[in-house]
Interface confidence: medium
């Protein structure tokens, strides 16, 4: 058993040009957190899967509100380490993720916002027992530097924490073939108990008689590299010499077995024996329970009430993952039609629409004379942004469902007065003039300037425009 | 009259990035969207994304996600894209466009910048 | 997202006559499809836009026609500054994409 440690020197702007701008502003004050997720082994997992290690959230930094004009600083840190305790032995390569997230203070419906503002990961090798190891990493135009140590908790010692120390018997020495426990001269390794030829860099043991082998070892001693099998090559020593057979790998080449957990042979597979806090099939799954609260981002934990049982995170809205530790880009979805711009507001999407449309998502054109239909036999005309009705005679409006007053216009010329009627006007027509705007003078010998005067209506007759 | 001012060319080293810029005139700058669009030699155009210099919403192209970043200056009526770990793939004429928000798409462009990434 | 494919790639005419060029769309964009010109030494110029609406300034031998999938620019009476590059564009969905081009010559 040990502590991983973590401190956080600073974040703030990388070196280079595109400084970031301050994530906090004077009208949205923001702090920050970390989160640091521990994996097991080199391997490169996706950033989703279990942090079977273990993980640690901060506390949250001082609230910080950007200088208006100044770049982004270096931004204030929260104080004291982060600590992910180990159960087990530490496995000496393991994958770390160091997010670190931004809480926005502003007035936010149903409490603070949390956004991930960068995420830094690696892989290394580290004894524990050893001095701090200092790192820099870049996420895009952020930088975070830190240091990071493995410590044994008493009485567990060595690179793996896997040695464990007893207070001296005899005020002298220690007991036949046990060595000092160093730093802690004044103790003792007690004796081992794992099981016989168990390997003392690459083996360890909990209980008397066992022997589990560290990331990247296997065999019933762990002596055995997991990118080799038992036998060397078909080349090589032959079978009656070694004791193994050279045809096929067998079904624990490779150590199916992730987080320590070591390999058997049964007759159709294997079987792996986990160490504690892990369990499944390969030993895949970590023994986190809902009390650790492994849910972020406001997730609902269901299950996990012990190790033994699995938990599961509940996601809220516009987060995923199996941790609820990755947001959700509904926008990627390109949910807003006509150009219009998508605002992932949490609990809700919104679409900005263009000038000339609306809707939700925008589906809707202001300007679309399709199925918009002008009443009383006016006809759609398309422009401008606005889709208009150009309405027939006595209509007006923007569908043409008011009734308009056909005279407001003047539209009987050279004097003419005008009289609505039911199907649009009547002009009556000054003496000189006719026609059905009055628009045509009559010559004094009486004739018209029109062919002739239709059927049944005089010169100076009322004249009803159709 | 409406104007995007983009310089000529930019020549940078791979794995850098570059900031490139077009300043609006001749219209109210936060009135209206603006559009970057890329044109590699001998090739069609690719919609990078939009943004609003209102307050800085922007929508991109998935393809340019985590490549090409937009940003405004109100106080010059600048846009600005930047493109980050530069490769040969990068290496291309970019345009800015102005959206008329009407329903009209991009009415005003700008003249270009030719990005050439080489060591 | 919506592929666009345009045709033909080339095109070879003489002034005063008129030319077509087509465009088909992947899936339905309603009528939301734009054209463009492109020539050197000038900026781009927006002709038409929703299928078929003249952009100002324009001159009226520039048509587009179409909607749902497939859309038409006519161009009648061919001018000198005519002979450029062309591209269609939808701007229903993002990402907005183009046309492959088309590359008209004086014959």
């Known amino acids: 058993a040990g502590v991983f440690e973590l401190q956080i020197h600073s974040f703030g702007p990388g070196p280079g040009p595109g400084a970031p701008r301050s994530p906090c502003s004077a009208r949205l004050p923001c702090r920050l957190f970390f989160r640091v997720c521990l994996k097991p082994g080199l391997s490169e997992e996706a950033a989703e899967s279990p942090c079977a290690l273990g993980a640690a959230l901060s506390a949250r930094g001082p609230v910080y509100t950007e200088q208006p004009g100044a770049p982004a600083p270096d931004l204030p840190l929260p104080d004291g380490l982060l600590q992910v305790p180990f159960r087990d032995a530490w496995p000496g390569t393991f994958s770390f993720i160091i997010e670190t997230w931004r809480e926005e203070l502003g007035d936010q419906i149903g409490g603070p916002a949390w956004s991930l503002l960068a995420r830094v990961a690696g892989r290394r090798r580290l004894a524990a027992g050893g001095p701090w190891a200092r790192d820099i990493q870049r996420a895009g135009a952020w930088e975070l530097r830190f240091s990071y140590r493995a410590r044994c908790e008493p009485p567990a010692v060595g690179t793996a924490c896997t040695r464990l120390c007893r207070p001296r018997s005899a005020p002298s020495r220690c007991g036949p073939g046990l060595r000092p426990c160093a730093p802690l001269e004044d103790e003792c390794e007690a004796p081992l108990v794992c099981r016989a030829g168990c390997s003392p860099e690459h083996g360890f043991c909990e209980q008397p008689g066992e022997c589990r082998c560290l990331e990247g070892w296997t065999g019933p001693l762990c002596t055995v590299p997991v990118s080799t099998s038992s036998c060397l090559s078909p080349r090589g020593p032959s079978s009656a010499t070694t004791g193994c057979l050279v045809p096929g790998p067998g079904p624990c080449d490779g150590n199916p077995c992730a987080n320590g957990g070591s390999c058997s042979e049964t007759p159709r597979s294997f079987e792996c024996t986990c160490p504690r806090g892990f369990y499944g099939l390969r030993c895949e799954v970590s023994g986190v329970t809902c009390a650790d609260g492994p849910c972020f981002n406001g997730g609902l934990c269901v299950g996990g009430a012990d190790p033994d049982s699995a938990y599961i995170c509940h996601c809220p809205p516009g987060f995923q993952g199996s941790n609820c530790e990755k947001r959700v880009d509904r926008c990627s979805l390109q949910p807003c039609r006509n150009g219009g711009l998508c605002l992932d507001l949490g609990h809700a999407l919104r679409c900005r629409c263009r000038a000339g449309f609306a809707g939700p998502r925008c589906e809707h054109d202001l300007d679309d004379c399709a199925g918009r239909a002008c009443a009383n036999g006016g006809t759609c005309v398309e422009g401008g942004g606005a889709h208009r009705c150009s309405c027939a005679l006595g209509f007006g409006g923007r569908d043409c469902r008011e009734r308009a007053d056909p005279c407001a216009a003047r539209p009987c010329a050279h004097g003419g007065r005008c009289y609505a009627h039911f199907s649009g006007l009547v002009c009556a027509c000054a003496p000189g003039y006719m026609g059905a705007r009055c628009e045509f003078p009559v010559h004094p010998d009486g004739a018209s300037a029109l062919p002739a005067a239709p059927p049944g209506l005089r010169p100076g007759d009322p004249q009803r425009y159709l | 009259q409406v104007q995007l001012q983009q310089p000529g060319a930019e020549l940078v080293r791979p794995g850098t990035s570059v900031k490139l810029s077009c300043k609006a005139s001749g219209y109210t700058f936060t009135s209206y969207w603006m559009h970057w669009v890329k044109q590699r030699p001998g090739q069609g155009l690719e919609w990078i994304g939009v943004?609003?210099?209102?307050?800085?919403?922007?929508n991109y192209n998935q393809e340019f996600k985590g490549k090409a970043t937009l940003t405004v200056d109100t106080s010059s009526s600048t846009a600005y894209m930047q493109l980050s770990s530069l490769t040969s793939e990068d290496s291309a004429v970019y345009y800015c466009a102005r959206d008329s928000t009407v329903v009209a798409p991009m009415d005003y462009w700008g003249q270009g910048t030719s990005v050439t990434v080489s060591s | 997202d919506v592929q666009i494919t345009q045709s033909p790639s080339y095109l070879a005419a003489s002034p005063g006559e008129t030319i077509t060029i087509n465009c088909r769309a992947s899936?339905?964009?309603?009528?939301?499809l734009a054209w463009y010109q492109e020539r050197p030494g000038k900026t781009n110029k927006l002709l038409i836009y929703?299928?078929?609406t003249l952009q100002s300034g324009i001159p009226s031998r520039f048509r587009g026609s179409g909607s749902g999938t497939d859309f038409t620019l006519t161009i009648s009476s061919l001018e000198p500054e005519d002979f450029a590059m062309y591209y269609c564009q939808q701007h229903h969905v993002y990402p907005y994409t183009f046309g492959g081009g088309t590359k008209l010559e004086i014959k």
């Open positions: 929703s299928g078929s």
């Open positions: 943004i609003d210099p209102s307050d800085s919403l922007a």
């Open positions: 899936t339905s964009i309603s009528k939301y």
